[in-house]
Structure formats: C-alpha cells, structure tokens
C-alpha cells in the first residue's frame, strides 16, 4: 500500500530534533550559513545553504536527507533567489528555524 509522504518529512524532522537535543558544543564549530526565505522552495534553499558546511558530521545526515526533497543537483557555492540577501546565521540557529518551519508544514499537511 502506498505510504503517505508525511513519513519522509517526519524522518527529516526527527533528525533535526536529534541535532538540536544532542547539541553539546557549538554546532559545526559555530559555522555561519546564509539565512533563507522559508516561505517557498524551502528544501532546496536549505540544502543550498547547508551544503557549504563541510567537515561537520552532525549535519551530514540532514544534508543528505534534504537531497531527497529537492529535485535538482545542488553544489557548494550555488544559491537561489531564496537566500536572504547578505544575512548569515549560525548553523544551530538555522537548524532550529528550519525545524520550526518543517513542523508547521507537517501540521498543515504540506509534505512535498
């Protein structure tokens, strides 16, 4: 039987919850990423921002999971118009903001 797309989004949310709950030292050594517009195309935009963080095992699974929600290949240094111009935030804050937004999408039934 076909499974609702919600299960995939739930897995992504659970991974983000794990990151925020298990955070001891500054996430990814306090690396900064571009803030994004969360109103549209959130998955690709989030991936385009997070893909520029390397050597941070804590978010590797998240980076990989986001690829399953984005139809096109994303490379480091690639940015869409969804980036908030010239605004960078810490990865930890980015993850928290993304988690809040994805939980909202989940509640509203917007799974893709």
């Amino acid at each position: 039987s076909p499974v609702p797309p919600s299960t995939a989004l739930k897995e992504l949310i659970e991974e983000l919850v794990n990151i925020t709950q298990n955070q001891k030292a500054p996430l990814c050594n306090g690396s900064m990423v571009w803030s994004i517009n969360l109103t549209a195309g959130v998955y690709c935009a989030a991936l385009e921002s997070l893909i520029n963080v390397s050597g941070c095992s804590a978010i590797e699974k998240t980076q990989r999971m986001l690829n399953g929600f984005c139809p096109h290949k994303v490379s480091a240094g690639q940015f869409s118009s969804l980036r908030v111009r010239d605004t960078k935030i810490e990865v930890a804050q980015f993850v928290k903001d993304l988690l809040v937004h994805l939980k909202k999408l989940f509640r509203e039934g917007q799974f893709n």
Partner: antibody, heavy 123, light 106 residues
C-alpha cells in the same frame, strides 16, 4: 542494526513465476524508497525496479517492464518483487536495497543492501 | 537509453593511486554514486553525491564529477581495496549502473 533479508529465490522454468520478499529490520522501511538490483553470474549490477517511499510510485527497467511488479506491505516492513514470464536472462542474484528518502529518493544513495537471493531460470 | 562507461580493469601497486573513470552524457549535471563489491559479497556504497564518503569509508576514497566524467580515486591503495567498482546515476526515471571496473592490487 539496519538489515534487509531477501527470500523467495529458487529454480523455475522459463515462463514461470516467483515472488521475492525483502524483510527490513532496524528502521521504518515505509519512510524510504526500496529497490531491487540484480547481478547475473559473472556480470555487472543491473537495477530492476524501485518503489518510492513518498506516494508509492513505481519504477522499472525496460528489460522487466510488464513482467515484474514491485510492491510493499508497510505493516510487515517488507518489499516484494513479483516476477512473471521469467526468461533465462533473468537468472541472477537479486539484491534488495534501502533507497533514499523523500519524493526525489534517487538523490540520496543506496545505503543498505541485503545479502541477495538467487533466481535460476532453466528448463 | 542512458549509458555509463567504465574501463574494464585498472591495476595499481600497493601505496599508489588508482583512478577509475565513469563516462556519461552530461554526467556532471547528475549526482554520481560509487559502489565497491568484493567477490561473494553485496555492494557497498563508498561515495555519494559525487564526492562525499559515508561513515566508515576510509579517507583514501575520494570522488569528483564534472562535464561528462565522474572519477573515483583511491589514494594509497591497499590490498583490501581489490574489488569491482561501479558508478551509478539516475536518468529519466531509471537508475543506471556503470559497466564496472575490476581493480587489481599488484
């Protein structure tokens, strides 16, 4: 531990049928896509079919389209491959694979492979 | 249908570098994945998203992908790296595996 265990292989005559099963443990298979990949004796890997975790879309290689059907029972955490009108060229080891997450699962990577089950089509 | 072409075999001395190519039309526009398969064993993912290593895969494995060619590089090759290697990509609703390369450590 994440594991996939295939079963259902065996010897079958040309034109016959078999149903392969793949039982998953250690994770929720229904959240992920699942694929079947085969390998003929002494040959390379050939993708056979995929079942998307998001919405249950199915995909098939041209070589099996119309003969094979992929399905999944989420309550049993099991992936299936129904193989009909079998041919000698379908003889291979069939691997069950945990595929990616989300609607574009193919952008993720085939992480977990079962040990494989052998299908022999011969008269 | 889409095709991925690899050299049938690559030989390398222990400690040296082995490079395996995978060629396909505009492959650089797609994600390339690499699998290692030892005799009698199931394949193992060694590189995903062109150049990323799954946890547990040694640092000597690296990858790149641009234009029409993806490359898997094994630096400081060890005897245990002797295996068949397959590239893979997705095109037009189908997965495509490369023809496979047998790496022999002399």
């Amino acid at each position: 531990e994440v594991q996939l265990l295939e079963s259902g292989g065996g010897l079958v005559q040309p034109g016959g049928s078999l149903r392969l099963s793949c039982a998953a443990s250690g994770f929720t298979f229904s959240s992920y896509a699942g694929s079947w990949v085969r390998q003929a004796p002494g040959k390379g890997l050939e993708w056979v079919s995929a079942f998307s975790g998001s919405g249950g879309s199915t995909y098939y290689a041209d070589s099996v389209k119309g003969r094979f059907t992929i399905s999944r029972d989420n309550s049993k955490n099991t992936l299936y491959l129904q193989m009909n009108s079998l041919r000698a060229e379908d003889t291979a080891v069939y691997y069950c694979v945990q595929d990616g997450l989300g609607p574009y699962f193919y952008n993720y990577g085939m992480d977990v492979w079962g040990q494989g089950t052998t299908v022999t089509v011969s008269s | 249908s889409y095709e991925l072409t690899q050299p049938p075999s690559v030989s390398v001395s222990p400690g040296q570098t082995a490079s395996i190519t995978c060629s396909g039309d505009k492959l650089g526009d797609k994600y390339a994945f690499w699998f290692q398969q030892k005799p009698g064993q199931s394949p193992v993912l060694v590189i995903y998203h062109d150049s990323k290593r799954p946890s547990g895969i040694p640092e000597r494995f690296s990858g790149s992908n641009s234009g029409d060619t993806a490359t898997l590089t094994i630096s400081g090759t060890q005897a245990m790296d002797e295996a068949d290697y397959y590239c893979q990509a997705w095109d037009s609703s189908t997965y495509v595996f490369g023809t496979g390369t047998k790496v022999t450590v002399l």
